[in-house]
């Protein structure tokens, strides 16, 4: 079948924009670290890169293949306020490269890390 | 309390980067429209803007206040393959402005639409 060049171009553009790669996302600090419900952070979120996007096949998942760690300083507030907001420096995982992996590859990668 | 200017600057930067605003995201076409399980799209995802980011209070949600619609052409594949991939043009919601709304404001907005 022959398809209009414009259609093919726009589809190719969509492929590129949605590919599996590190993307800037907002991470809820409290949820990321499962902190106590009486502890809050200001700002409540930080911006980091995490793998995201779509893979060509349903059996594949977009996963990080390398990670760096970013230190960010935030204000921590504990209720009831025994003291004012205190600056805390927290380290966040920042995905630097990604790959579409089969679900079994993901399983193997995860289990090889937790067995160490 | 007096805080280091660098700390305040980096925190302010984090606030700005994580604020509630339209963000480029990948949308799974099949999931967005709840299509039949034997229908696939190539690419499976499209890139659109959706509201995202964090609000200053737990009682608030980042919601769209205005939306445009983008038409995108994709290949639709139906299994079993009675014919080759056919180009289809689909309209996707693209959030153009956002606001942090209380959960009840979200309720009001949603329920006023479905009552029309």
């Amino acid at each position: 079948a022959h398809y209009n060049t414009e259609i093919l171009k726009s589809i190719d553009n969509e492929w590129r924009k949605t590919q599996c790669m590190p993307r800037e996302v907002c991470i809820d600090v409290g949820k990321e670290f499962g902190v106590a419900t009486n502890t809050f952070f200001k700002p409540p979120c930080v911006s980091v890169y995490r793998c995201g996007g779509c893979c060509n096949s349903e059996g594949l998942q977009c996963m990080n293949t390398s990670t760096s760690y970013l230190s960010k300083t935030l204000f921590e507030i504990t209720v009831p306020l025994s003291q004012g907001p205190k600056p805390v420096t927290i380290s966040f995982a920042n995905h630097t490269s990604c790959r579409c992996m089969s679900k079994l590859d993901v399983y193997r990668q995860v289990h090889s890390i937790i067995r160490r | 309390a007096h805080y280091n200017t660098e700390i305040l600057k980096s925190i302010d930067n984090e606030w700005r980067k994580t604020q509630c605003m339209p963000r480029e995201v990948c949308i799974d076409v099949g999931k967005e429209f709840g299509v039949a399980t034997n229908t696939f799209f190539k690419p499976p995802c499209v890139s659109v803007y959706r509201c995202g980011g964090c609000c200053n209070s737990e009682g608030l949600q980042c919601m769209n206040t205005s939306t445009s619609y983008l038409s995108k052409t994709l290949f639709e594949i139906t299994v079993p393959l009675s014919q080759g991939p056919k180009p289809v043009t689909i309209s996707f919601a693209n959030h153009t402005s956002c606001r942090c709304m209380s959960k009840l404001d979200v309720y009001r907005q949603v329920h006023s639409i479905i009552r029309r």
Partner: antibody
């Protein structure tokens, strides 16, 4: 006309569970948010929970959070309140009420009495 | 949580005379959409509550015009221009600007 009929109330021991139902008729149930409101004997009104028209969002009063679950079945035009770990202070008449766009209530059922007692 | 304070606690009125109930909220009920989410309900003896007034001053369908609501921000009033025997019961104000929704403690109206 709008009708809401609660059922499922009764006497229950502390720590036990109970499920209340509210049968709705006279309006398109699937287009309305719904609430549960309660009233302890001789006391004022206390809002308990809200559920969105499609069941996608639910919010609760702190006094019942983690113990009560609001749900709905739009195919049966029925609202539910699953109550667990019941306490003496949950003794009340429980009303279901239809939500307005403003998130208040316009029509109420007659109520069903829940008594938590050993 | 927003605290709703109603006064008086009870009211004894002669038929045909006016009555007034006050409701004060601990914070403004004026929302960013320009609406004020304050409602009035009447609970007659042995019955469920019924909606009287929507968003401060709008009478709900079927509510007699002797009932009127007014106010703004944090101060609201329900007035009955001429009390009738059927108006007895407990009146409640409600805020729905934010969760949790909260009611006033109620004002009991009886006939002298």
């Amino acid at each position: 006309q709008v009708q809401l009929v609660e059922s499922g109330g009764g006497v229950v021991q502390p720590g036990r569970s109970l499920r209340l139902s509210c049968a709705a008729s006279g309006f398109t149930f699937s287009r309305y948010g719904m609430h549960w409101v309660r009233q302890a004997p001789g006391k004022g009104l206390e809002w308990v929970a809200i559920i969105w028209y499609d069941g996608s969002d639910k919010y609760y009063a702190d006094s019942v959070k983690g113990r009560f679950t609001i749900s709905r079945d739009n195919s049966k035009n029925t609202l539910y309140l699953q109550m667990s770990s019941l306490r003496a202070e949950d003794t009340a008449v429980y009303y279901c009420a239809r939500g307005t766009v403003g998130a208040s209530f316009d029509y109420w059922g007659q109520g069903t009495l829940v008594t938590v007692s050993s | 949580d927003i605290v709703m304070t109603q006064t008086p606690l009870s009211l004894s009125v002669t038929p045909g005379q006016p009555a007034s109930i006050s409701c004060k909220s601990s914070q403004s009920l004026l929302n960013s959409d320009g609406k004020t989410y304050l409602y009035w309900y009447l609970q007659k003896p042995g019955q469920p509550p019924q909606l009287l007034i929507n968003e401060v001053s709008n009478r709900f369908s079927g509510v007699p015009d002797r009932f009127s609501g007014s106010g703004s921000g944090t101060d609201f009033t329900l007035k009955i221009s001429r009390v009738e025997a059927e108006d007895v019961g407990v009146y409640y104000c409600l805020q729905s600007i934010q969760l949790p929704l909260t009611f006033g403690g109620g004002t009991k109206v009886e006939i002298k």
